[in-house]
């Protein structure tokens, strides 16, 4: 079914999200001792490794963009402070229309 | 056909607990796609969105600040209903609240609206 | 919480007049912006969605534009049926926030 269809997909990105993570610090010289944050899969999309201050912009899923093509719509920042990651603003929830991913049960 | 019946009192004491229900026909409050949402309209604050409840494999609650000490939002699954109850009330409250489905196409949006309920809060 | 302002707060048409209806955000929305028609009594109902999307049923004399923090709403050839209060509301920061509304009277 289409749940089984998109978890497929998650786990394709998760993973995919992982190896660039690990790309981006090699970039930037990233290790666990390092100010900043590190990269992260959230578990519906992939935060790329950044210094204190930095805010990073995503977008929605692709999977879930299928339903909102306005370039100017489906964007979510974190910003990277002392204490880590802020929380995702707007909520996944407002911006993309879901707010976690359900794999099938 | 979505349709949405409010029930409960229009006179509420203050200090007590507002209560009133949604009851939905022509879809289910477990519905994936939706949200269950009540909003209030008074001459003083306009239309205010108070939060929602709805289902993703769990339940979950949005509220707003202004009420989020005061207020719970339940489904009922076995009677496809959802309520509002918000507590310690005072005269600010007084409004008419109504019921709303929300669902997304590139945003939320209010699409079927209860009739209204005017809920006055007096001694 | 996000502040949403409509301007004029009322104004008198004529049926057949062309009308327009402006909406502003105090921040950025992008296009998370939907309009709704009230009748004295009665609950909201929906006309436009995600700024410019036109709810299925409305008629196509409704239209919408904007993205940022200016909006309007556009009725083409006003018709009997269309006098009513029209409210704008944010749908991308909790809690949602809706404008004070314009009141749309017979001339």
């Known amino acids: 079914g289409s749940m089984a269809h998109s978890d497929g997909i998650f786990k394709k990105e998760q993973a995919m999200c992982l190896e660039k993570i690990q790309r981006a610090n090699e970039l930037m010289g990233f290790n666990d001792s390092s100010p900043g944050c590190p990269g992260m899969w959230d578990n519906i999309t992939c935060w790329k490794p950044a210094h204190v201050g930095e805010m990073v912009l995503v977008s929605c899923p692709e999977l879930f963009r299928i339903f909102n093509p306005d370039q100017d719509m489906g964007v979510v920042s974190r910003n990277c402070t002392e204490d880590g990651w802020s929380e995702p603003f707007p909520h996944y929830f407002d911006a993309c229309g879901f707010d976690e991913y359900e794999s099938e049960t | 056909q979505v349709q949405l019946q409010q029930s409960g009192p229009g006179l509420v004491k203050p200090s007590q607990t507002l209560s009133l229900t949604c009851a939905i026909s022509?879809?289910?409050?477990?519905?994936?796609?939706?949200?269950w949402n009540w909003i209030r309209q008074s001459p003083s604050r306009g239309l205010e969105w108070l939060g929602r409840?709805?289902?993703?494999?769990?339940?979950?609650?949005h509220y707003a600040v202004s009420v989020k000490s005061r207020i719970t939002i339940n489904p009922d699954t076995s009677k496809s209903q959802f309520s509002l109850q918000l507590n310690s009330v005072t005269p600010e409250d007084t409004a008419v609240y109504y019921c709303?489905?929300?669902?997304?196409?590139?945003?939320?949006?209010?699409?079927?609206w209860g009739q209204g309920t005017l809920v006055t809060v007096s001694s | 919480d996000i502040q949403m302002t409509q301007s004029p707060s009322s104004l008198s048409a004529s049926v057949g007049d062309r009308i327009t209806i402006t909406c502003r955000a105090s921040?950025?929305?992008?296009?998370?912006l939907n309009w709704y028609q009230q009748k004295p009594g009665k609950a909201p109902k929906l006309l436009i969605y995600?700024?410019?999307n036109l709810q299925s049923g409305i008629p196509s004399r409704f239209s919408g534009s904007g993205s940022g923090t200016d909006f309007t709403l556009t009725i083409n050839s006003l018709q009997p049926e269309d006098f009513a209060t029209y409210f704008c509301?944010?749908?991308?920061?909790?809690?949602?926030?809706f404008g004070p509304g314009t009141k749309v009277d017979i001339k």
């Open positions: 709303a489905r929300g669902m997304w196409n590139q945003n939320w949006f209010l699409d079927h």
């Open positions: 409840t709805y289902y993703r494999g769990k339940w979950k609650n």
């Open positions: 921040q950025q929305i992008a296009r998370y």
């Open positions: 022509g879809d289910s409050v477990s519905n994936k796609q939706a949200t």
């Open positions: 509301q944010q749908a991308i920061i909790q809690p949602y926030t």
């Open positions: 995600a700024s410019y």
